[in-house]
């Protein structure tokens, strides 16, 4: 499999058959698949060097792995997008052997003197062809030469089979399955041959191709493949339940932010709640996690403005649940990214010198910002797309807080909507879905560059649109939701999570 290890070295060779038998639409589809693969790999913070070859009678090398920009995913994607099927129109035979020889030439080194680290570089060949080679001879011989060059299968104690993966995608109206199978790697419990039909569900294909065991701790990563559970798609999501004898129970959401901490809303708890009465579950697991302590933001005080006629005051409505035992990360339990951390800098593919302010400008620009939250409906986790009103609609969004029960007498809305809040909901630019009571404490998320970054914690809403946990279809335009802006509580997060190796900026 493609081992996505951010500290490893990898060359990926994209080889695309542009011969007559492929056809223009299949060629375009194959290109799209490769663009998606480049993006998927880049989302892991991995920077492989790419080689890009198209071929028919002759190969054409568009990108060499030795080029400075070959590890720049955006640049490689641009080169790929500029390739036309017509480029091989005049000489449209199928010489797969010559194309693979072009790959061999990129792998090999001058004067037989291997560069430092050659033996730690993994090589992945992704060949898109119909397998109908009609000139140049059998391409399998070049695969053998490549194996020889990389010293694969020659040392009994160190076969190095994981240093070469050959994936073959059958494209075109007619595919020679025998030829395709012969070229692809054969490894136990792995799939290296894919058909056109598979390309309709690329996430499923990538799930078969990628080994992410070295990057399970990466924040904000998800799998969207069809066989995936809700928690493959939202691996950070935590369900919180507080049992109060004779008072029933309170349900909230939270987000895994590190191996020991879940971030949620402070209002989910009271000062009387004992740790043993708080149930937290992650990854869709039945068992509850043991809790060591709940840490409230020191400035949170729900009764802080009672004298001023404000029954409930949600400023600084954030809490961290510290777990007794370390979480074991896997595909259904992973952290979400937090603002102003090194992990988020990498997730957004920003330079290492990026400041907290620059992250804020990237994630929360002064405009309507597409975001999402996760809600549970009929025992299923679903993503709800909303817009954070952070531009010209911000004022009107915040003013609608006056329609919240108990806030109708508030003279100055900034008394309840402090600078700590982000506002969503309403009907412009689109009709936003609203949060339900049970969504409180869950993350408000910005999805960028295939990664998920938490920018807020769901706190309170103007209108209860969820009678009996069923969302009403028709809701008033003033149905707004308010979320604690994580950029505004960073000193507290940084202090409480200082031992979690998140690399706060």
């Amino acid at each position: 499999k493609i081992v996505l290890d951010p500290s490893g070295s990898m060359n990926i060779y994209l080889v695309l058959d542009g011969s007559d038998s492929i056809g223009a639409s299949n060629f375009t589809g194959a290109k799209k698949c490769l663009v998606n693969l480049i993006e998927k790999v880049a989302s892991y913070g991995v920077k492989p060097r790419y080689g890009l070859v198209t071929y028919a009678t002759y190969p054409k090398i568009w990108v060499k792995v030795s080029e400075a920009d070959s590890s720049n995913a955006d640049w490689v994607t641009k080169q790929l997008n500029e390739i036309n099927y017509e480029d091989h129109k005049l000489k449209s035979g199928t010489n797969t052997k010559k194309a693979l020889q072009a790959v061999y030439s990129m792998m090999s080194w001058p004067d037989d003197v291997p560069p430092e680290g050659w033996n730690r570089t993994r090589h992945v060949i992704i060949l898109m062809t119909d397998g109908l080679h009609n000139m140049g001879g059998d391409p399998i011989t070049v695969i053998d030469e490549i194996r020889d060059l990389l010293y694969i299968g020659k040392d009994r104690k160190n076969p190095r089979e994981d240093y070469l993966d050959v994936y073959v995608f059958g494209v075109g109206p007619l595919v020679n399955q025998v030829n395709i199978n012969a070229l692809a790697s054969k490894k136990d419990n792995e799939q290296h041959v894919f058909k056109v039909k598979d390309m309709e569900n690329l996430e499923d294909v990538f799930y078969q191709m990628i080994d992410e065991s070295q990057s399970l701790s990466l924040c904000g990563m998800v799998w969207e493949h069809r066989k995936g559970t809700d928690y493959h798609k939202q691996p950070w999501q935590a369900k919180i339940s507080v049992i109060r004898p004779s008072k029933g129970h309170e349900s909230c959401m939270g987000a895994v932010v590190s191996e020991y901490f879940v971030l949620t809303a402070a209002h989910c708890f009271t000062v009387d709640d004992k740790e043993h009465s708080i149930k937290v579950s992650v990854g869709g697991e039945k068992r509850d996690l043991e809790i060591e302590v709940v840490l409230f933001h020191p400035n949170y005080n729900i009764n802080g403005k009672k004298e001023a006629g404000i029954p409930e005051f949600y400023d600084y409505d954030v809490a961290l649940i510290k777990l007794k035992n370390k979480l074991k990360y896997g595909q259904t339990i992973r952290p979400i990214c937090l603002p102003c951390t090194e992990g988020t800098t990498r997730a957004l593919r920003l330079p290492p010198t990026t400041t907290c302010q620059q992250q804020k400008e990237e994630l929360l620009p002064a405009q309507d910002i597409k975001a999402l939250f996760v809600s549970e409906e009929e025992k299923k986790l679903t993503r709800k797309e909303v817009y954070i009103k952070n531009g010209d609609k911000k004022g009107s969004c915040e003013r609608d807080a006056q329609y919240a029960p108990g806030y109708d007498k508030v003279k100055d809305i900034s008394e309840v909507v402090t600078p700590r809040f982000l506002c969503t909901g309403g009907v412009s630019p689109y009709a936003d879905p609203n949060t339900c009571r049970g969504d409180s404490g869950g993350p408000l998320i910005v999805h960028k560059r295939s990664r998920f970054i938490q920018v807020g914690v769901i706190s309170w809403g103007v209108v209860d649109v969820c009678k009996n946990q069923k969302r009403q279809k028709q809701v008033p335009a003033h149905a707004r939701d308010f979320h604690i802006n994580l950029f505004q509580v960073l000193p507290w997060l940084k202090e409480k999570l200082q031992d979690e190796d998140l690399g706060f900026l």
């Epitope: 037989d112 291997p114 033996n119 010293y151 020659k154 040392d155 009994r156 104690k157 160190n158 190095r160």
Partner: antibody
């Protein structure tokens, strides 16, 4: 056809130095471990050391009895293995064989004819 | 280091008889499902010759009367029916752990 030919043996005084060579042909030299094995007169075989193949950067390993005194090196452009022997002792007297160590099964499948080193005053 | 002990030191047999040579290792020479034990034959004035590799695999060009068996620490070289040219010294050698080591040898002589 695989061939290994040792040279450089001879008579040397205790404390002296000698360099043995092993010229090879018929196989891809850099892809193999290459070992030196010695045999004292009337005694059994004793492994001296080896140079690993290219994946391991041709790093070396030695028997305790020669460590610090003997150095194995190779010139891949000449397909030749060397054994530099310093601070020689009388107990180093032996026939020195060079052998190809096949990483496909970690056994010495081809041997040279050997070269005699005599350490005596 | 792994010490290899061969027995017997000398074995006197007649042509046509079956020879069984033993080699015991001070610790296991197995790794990842393979036993890294090899057997060599050496005749006077000649270089050693590989007979068996990885405990039981016959090197190409070696007659089928030679066979190897064993795993872990106990290994056996068997010659099913001795031919006159089989009388020589036999060495076992482990290549599982550095440094490589040889047994002291078993001399197979004509009775």
């Amino acid at each position: 056809e695989v061939q290994l030919v040792e040279s450089g043996g001879g008579l040397v005084q205790p404390g002296g130095s000698l360099r043995l060579s092993c010229a090879t042909s018929g196989f891809t030299f850099r892809d193999y471990y290459m070992s030196w094995v010695r045999q004292a007169p009337g005694k059994g075989l004793e492994w001296v050391g080896f140079s690993r193949h290219r994946v391991y950067g041709y790093t070396t390993e030695y028997a305790a009895s020669v460590k610090g005194r003997f150095t194995i090196s190779r010139d891949n452009s000449k397909n030749t293995l060397y054994l530099q022997m310093n601070s020689l002792k009388t107990e180093d007297t032996a026939v020195y064989y060079c052998a190809r160590d096949n990483p496909g099964y970690y056994a010495m499948d081809y041997w040279g004819q050997g070269t005699l080193v005599t350490v005596s005053s | 280091e792994i010490v290899l002990t061969q027995s017997p030191a000398t074995l006197s047999l007649s042509p046509g008889e079956r020879a069984t040579l033993s080699c015991k290792a001070s610790q296991s020479v197995d790794y990842d499902g393979d036993s890294y034990m090899n057997w060599y034959q050496q005749k006077p004035g000649q270089a050693p010759r590989l007979l068996i590799y990885a405990a039981s695999n016959l090197e190409s060009g070696i007659p089928a009367r030679f066979s190897g068996s064993g795993s872990g620490t106990d290994f056996t070289l068997t010659i099913s029916s001795l031919e006159p040219e089989d009388f020589a010294v036999y060495y076992c050698q482990q290549s599982n752990a550095d440094p490589y080591t040889f047994g002291q040898g078993t001399k197979l002589e004509i009775k």
